[in-house]
């Protein structure tokens, strides 16, 4: 009978704790309520991962995590009668999941992916040290907008690195970018240990280069106008404008955080266009401009990947050497 048990009494442990993997890297633990829990107890479940990380107290009898399964991961679960973290939960029950078997030295290394211009993802990796040179690799990927796991078809080599690219287009007006792409690389023969990675869609984004539309002089200032890469709004980008002067052989680099086209000298209302005024430029000399962009922390987690440089554009006259 469960009569007058005090809520502070330690509850029995949860039962039937099990673990499974969905997609490529979604690990799900489920359990049943404890047997013989006191009737006046509103059950809550305390759980944390093996290293005491991500403590959680919730009423659900499941917990999931998106994690690259390159290492063993364990969840400990206990039951309690309140949301109070200081309440001692029941005996904790633990369930672990191990990565697929295989020689760790056979697994690929440096598995990383870059989302190019929010239109396709390019992943690359190095072969494991303990693998045969004729190993054939396969990359699998999954994200929320896919119904099932897909196999990447376009395997290529760049030097010692292997790679594969697949279409991944930003979906407008959705929480698409708040999610991640799950990646796994293994070999066709099943001889190597699979490698996993999770790529958050707010990081590792490399924009296409911008396109310079117009250069013009006003007094001793150089006005630069360019078109940003498709799929990006200008406030989400950070710019680097490089100006080389042929006569003085100077090389000036300007880091531009905001590039609004508010000056009357700039062509107005051109969609997705940015502008910058370079001060103190000699109009009677040849000036060559190029621009590159990268994502900023306003919209993205990562701000390390510069685009390639734009095509150069020049303005002014090349002086004759006397």
């Amino acid at each position: 009978g469960g009569g007058g048990a005090a809520p502070t009494e330690t509850q029995p442990p949860v039962t039937n704790l099990s673990v499974s993997v969905e997609n490529l890297c979604t690990v799900i633990w489920t359990w049943n309520p404890p047997e013989g829990a006191s009737s006046n107890c509103s059950l809550w479940y305390f759980s944390h991962f093996g290293d005491k990380q991500d403590k959680k107290i919730a009423p659900e009898t499941r917990r999931s995590i998106e994690v690259p399964l390159n290492e063993r991961i364990c969840l400990q679960v206990g039951s309690q009668c309140s949301t109070n973290e200081s309440e001692k939960p029941s005996i904790l029950v633990e369930k672990c999941i191990s990565p697929p078997e295989g020689d760790p030295e056979s697994a690929v290394t440096e598995l990383q992916c870059i989302w190019h211009n929010l239109s396709y993802m390019k992943c690359s990796w190095l072969p494991g040290r303990n693998t045969s040179p004729d190993t054939n690799y396969t990359l699998y990927y999954w994200h929320r907008s896919l119904e099932k796991i897909h196999q990447c078809e376009n395997i290529f080599r760049e030097g010692q690195y292997f790679g594969c690219s697949f279409d991944l287009t930003k979906v407008k007006d959705s929480s698409f970018e708040q999610h991640s792409v799950q990646i796994m690389v293994k070999d066709n023969a099943g001889k190597i240990k699979p490698s996993f990675n999770i790529v958050p869609l707010t990081s590792r984004v490399k924009p296409d280069p911008p396109h310079i539309k117009n250069l013009s002089f006003h007094n001793d200032d150089l006005y630069v106008q360019w078109e940003n890469p498709q799929n990006f709004i200008s406030r989400c980008l950070f710019y680097e404008v490089e100006v080389n002067n042929s006569q003085t052989e100077t090389h000036n680099v300007f880091y531009v955080q905001e590039a609004k086209c508010e000056n009357p000298e700039f062509e107005r209302n051109v969609e997705n266009t940015s502008c910058f005024m370079v001060p103190g430029v000699l109009p009677d000399t040849l000036n060559t401009v190029r621009i590159r962009v990268k994502t900023n922390k306003l919209c993205y987690e990562d701000d390390k990947l510069w685009s390639n440089w734009s095509q150069e554009m020049s303005i002014g006259k090349k002086r004759n050497s006397t």
């Epitope: 030295e105 290394t109 440096e110 190095l126 072969p127 040290r129 040179p133 030097g159």
Partner: antibody, heavy 118, light 107 residues
Framework: EVQVLESGGGLVQPGGSLRLSCAAS????????MTWVRQAPGKGLEWVST????????YYADSVKGRFTISRDNSKNTVYLQMNSLRAEDTAVYYC???????????WGRGTLVTVSS | EIVLTQSPDFQSVTPKEKVTITCRAS??????LHWYQQKPDQSPKLLIK???QSFSGVPSRFSGSGSGTDFTLTINSLEAEDAAAYYC?????????FGQGTKLEIK
């Protein structure tokens, strides 16, 4: 033409330091691991250290672990070997080599001589 | 660590002769074995990759064979310019290891 060229060797006292450089040209530097191999006078070849193309994976021979540091600057197409706490047994010609494929060395530099002596 | 043992350590041969150098690994390394040639006062040069694949630009008289633990470098019809030290190298796992070398002298 694919080339690698070492520099920075010389005479150093035991316990001293030296930094070797290896400048590469003629290939996409960041796509290839670079390796240092040494050869003591009149002896065979000994692998010293390797750094992967992007610099994320670094490996050392037990004989130099904790004393030598390999690094690379992909913007300069250069790999470095910082050698600290040098010993007499580190005396050797140090070769820089470009790795290819499944870990073989297809291009070697001419080598730079490091002499550790008091 | 995988130990490579070459034999012979030294060989004196006459031009046009066929030369065989062997390399034995302390454990199976598949085809992850490569052969290098080092002429006096020069840096090593790749001859054979993956046990049997000739590297580009290497004369056809050089060939390699074997897999697992036993490997062979063969020089058919030796030429005077082949006087050098020859090294086998294992690249399966780390550390990379070299054989002790075989010095080839032309009579």
């Amino acid at each position: 033409e694919v080339q690698v060229l070492e520099s920075g060797g010389g005479l150093v006292q035991p316990g001293g330091s030296l930094r070797l450089s290896c400048a590469a040209s003629g290939f996409t530097f960041s796509n290839y691991a670079m390796t240092w191999v040494r050869q003591a006078p009149g002896k065979g070849l000994e692998w010293v250290s390797t750094i992967s193309g992007r610099g994320y994976s670094i490996y050392y021979a037990d004989s130099v672990k904790g004393r030598f540091t390999i690094s690379r600057d992909n913007s300069k197409n250069t790999v470095y070997l910082q050698m600290n706490s040098l010993r007499a047994e580190d005396t050797a010609v140090y070769y820089c080599a470009k790795e290819e494929g499944h870990w073989y060395f297809d291009v070697w530099g001419r080598g730079t001589l490091v002499t550790v002596s008091s | 660590e995988i130990v490579l043992t070459q034999s012979p350590d030294f060989q004196s041969v006459t031009p046009k002769e066929k030369v065989t150098i062997t390399c034995r690994a302390s454990q199976s390394i598949g085809s992850s074995l490569h052969w290098y040639q080092q002429k006096p006062d020069q840096s090593p040069k790749l001859l054979i990759k993956y046990a049997s694949q000739s590297f580009s630009g290497v004369p056809s008289r050089f060939s390699g064979s074997g897999s697992g633990t036993d490997f062979t470098l063969t020089i058919n019809s030796l030429e005077a310019e082949d006087a050098a030290a020859y090294y086998c190298m294992n690249s399966l796992g780390l550390p990379y290891t070299f054989g002790q070398g075989t010095k080839l002298e032309i009579k």
